[in-house]
Each structure stands twice: as structure tokens, then as C-alpha cells.
């Protein structure tokens, strides 16, 4: 990774853009800690491993998060 | 639409200081990671500094380290270069441009939005 | 710290001909690290690839990016003549942070 991590937060902008939960490899949530200040989405895409910061403050990415936690609570026993 | 206008440039003597400012419109400034890269005359691009979204993250090219600070007040839309200790190398346009949608440190959007560029000449 | 090699200086092509750009790095860059400009003289340069070969908002599909390791190449399949000027390629990595190519000039023939 380029940049140093002693701070620090990763996401250098953030975006609105839902994204399809079919096209998602992964999605990390990432919480406010002393390295940094906010609270980081960040989706890796399936196609050429992609990743991208998601304002967690979105309607369009509250509304993803539910899906997925939807999604993942169908698959777990 | 969307669009970035610098201002704050002009002709100042070496060792002076000078703040570059650059307003935004018609996108929320606020989710962007903002850059200043300049450009001397007849010469190729330089990336100056870095400033993150929510401004937690400043990086500095080499050649400015410990002379300019890249700030942003998010409430104005604006982001800002102050220059100190100029030198005759400083001399270049200088454009503020916006950080792609979504970019981080291990996924790079590249520079989506360029504003027009202002001159500044430091010259005795 | 990673220096970008942009060949050739300039590149003489004609409207209709095929524009093959070449920038290469002292070190390895990941794919994901990579962009190419375009900038006209007296303009502001504009976005036209990044993560080596995803092609910006708006860009006509005539421009392409390639490459990996070291070696990177932005080909334009069919010179129009809006598209001669000079083109930059950037790498984000370690200090300095953010690094531009000494450009390539595109003239006409």
C-alpha cells in the first residue's frame, strides 16, 4: 500500500453510487478508532478487484448494507 | 455543472507567501478528496499536495514539504494552498483538480475534475 | 521513489492513424495505481484512463489502456483530430506521493 498507515483513515473520497450486490467480492465496515476519526465502508468489486470508499451516511448505501446483512443471515445455518 | 475555479494567484517577491483558494461547484465538495498540482512554464505536470475528504488525510510532494499547507473548509466549498517561503521554482500554474468517486489508498480514480489553473510568478 | 519514462518525446501521426503511447516505471506499479491525461495547450489536462485500463466517464471508446509491472500503454485505435496534444501518464505510490510522466507530444504529420 502506498501510504502509510500511522494514521490513518483509507478512503480519500467517498461515494453515493449503490452498488449491486451481485457485482460485490466483499464489503468491509470499518469503525471510527484512534487511526481514524469516521466510520469506513469499503466495497471490493468482483471485476478487477476494484475497491470503493461508500459515504456511510447514504440512504442508497444504509439500504445496501441491509441487503447484504439480509443476504448473509439467509446463508448462515 | 460541475466545476472548480482557482483564484488567489499573482506576481510576489521570493521568501513571500501567497494563499491559492479554489471554489467548487455543482457536486458535493464535501465527499472529494481535493489536489493542487502545478504546472511551470513549458514544462510537464507536478503533483503538489493532497487532502482527503474530511481533511484527515495531507500528503506533500518533496519539493513543498514544510513550505505549503493544503487545508479545506467544507462549509464554503473551498479548498486552499498557502504558500511560504516561495521561490523563483514555485513559479507555475497552479490547478486545483478533484479526487475520483470512491478513491482510497489501494484503488486510485485517478484526478476526475480539473479546474482552469492561476498563475503565480515569483519574481523579484 | 518511482520514476515514470514516457516514450517517444513526440509522436507525428496523421488523422485515421493508429497512436501507440508508451510509459514505463523504475519499479513495479500495481494496475490499480495507474492514469493517463490528455492536455491541450492553454486547457486544463483531463482524465482519460485509470487503474491502467478502465476508460473516465465520457471518454470516446477509441481511446484504450493496457499494461502491468512496468509497462503501461494508452493506444488511440483512430486519431481524430481533437486528439492532438500532449498526454501524461501518472502513478500513485510512495514518496512522492502522486507522479506524472514527462508527457507526449501527439502532432500532426
Known amino acids: 500500500v502506498p501510504l502509510s498507515r500511522t494514521v490513518r483513515c483509507t478512503c480519500i473520497s467517498i461515494s453515493n453510487q449503490p452498488v449491486n450486490p451481485r457485482s460485490l467480492e466483499k464489503l468491509e465496515i470499518i469503525p471510527a478508532s484512534q487511526f481514524c476519526p469516521r466510520v469506513e465502508i469499503i466495497a471490493t468489486m468482483k471485476k478487477k478487484g476494484e475497491k470503493r470508499c461508500l459515504n456511510p451516511e447514504s440512504k442508497a448505501i444504509k439500504n445496501l448494507l441491509k441487503a447484504v446483512s439480509k443476504e448473509r443471515s439467509k446463508r448462515s445455518p | 455543472q460541475v466545476q472548480l475555479v482557482e483564484s488567489g494567484g499573482g506576481v510576489v517577491q521570493p521568501g513571500r507567501s501567497l494563499r491559492l483558494s479554489c471554489t467548487a461547484s455543482?457536486?458535493?465538495?464535501?465527499?472529494?478528496?481535493m489536489h493542487w498540482v502545478r504546472q511551470a512554464p513549458g514544462k510537464g505536470l507536478e503533483w503538489v499536495a493532497v487532502?482527503?475528504?474530511?481533511?484527515?488525510?495531507?500528503y506533500y510532494a518533496d519539493s513543498v514539504k514544510g513550505r505549503f499547507t493544503i487545508s479545506r473548509d467544507n462549509s464554503k466549498n473551498t479548498l486552499y494552498l498557502q504558500m511560504n517561503s516561495l521561490r523563483a521554482e514555485d513559479t507555475a500554474v497552479y490547478y486545483c483538480?478533484?479526487?475520483?468517486?470512491?478513491?482510497?489508498?489501494?484503488?486510485?480514480?485517478?484526478?476526475?475534475?480539473w479546474g482552469q489553473g492561476t498563475t503565480v510568478t515569483v519574481s523579484s | 521513489e518511482i520514476v515514470l519514462t514516457q516514450s517517444p518525446g513526440t509522436l507525428s501521426l496523421s488523422p485515421g492513424e493508429r497512436a501507440t503511447l508508451s510509459c514505463r516505471a523504475s519499479?513495479?506499479?500495481?494496475?490499480?495505481?495507474l492514469a493517463w491525461y490528455q492536455q491541450k495547450p492553454g486547457q486544463a489536462p483531463r482524465l482519460l484512463i485509470y487503474g491502467a485500463s478502465s476508460r473516465a466517464t465520457g471518454i470516446p471508446d477509441r481511446f484504450s489502456g493496457s499494461g502491468s509491472g512496468t509497462d503501461f500503454t494508452l493506444t488511440i485505435s483512430r486519431l481524430e483530430p481533437e486528439d492532438f496534444a500532449v498526454y501524461y501518464c501518472?502513478?500513485?505510490?510512495?514518496?512522492?506521493?502522486?507522479?506524472f510522466g514527462p508527457g507526449t507530444k501527439v502532432d500532426i504529420k
Open positions: 455543482g457536486f458535493t465538495f464535501s465527499q472529494y478528496g
Open positions: 483538480a478533484r479526487e475520483g468517486e470512491g478513491s482510497n489508498i489501494y484503488y486510485y480514480y485517478g484526478m476526475d475534475v
Open positions: 487532502i482527503s475528504y474530511g481533511g484527515d488525510i495531507k
Open positions: 519499479q513495479s506499479v500495481s494496475s490499480s495505481y
Open positions: 501518472q502513478q500513485y505510490g510512495s514518496s512522492p506521493i502522486f507522479t
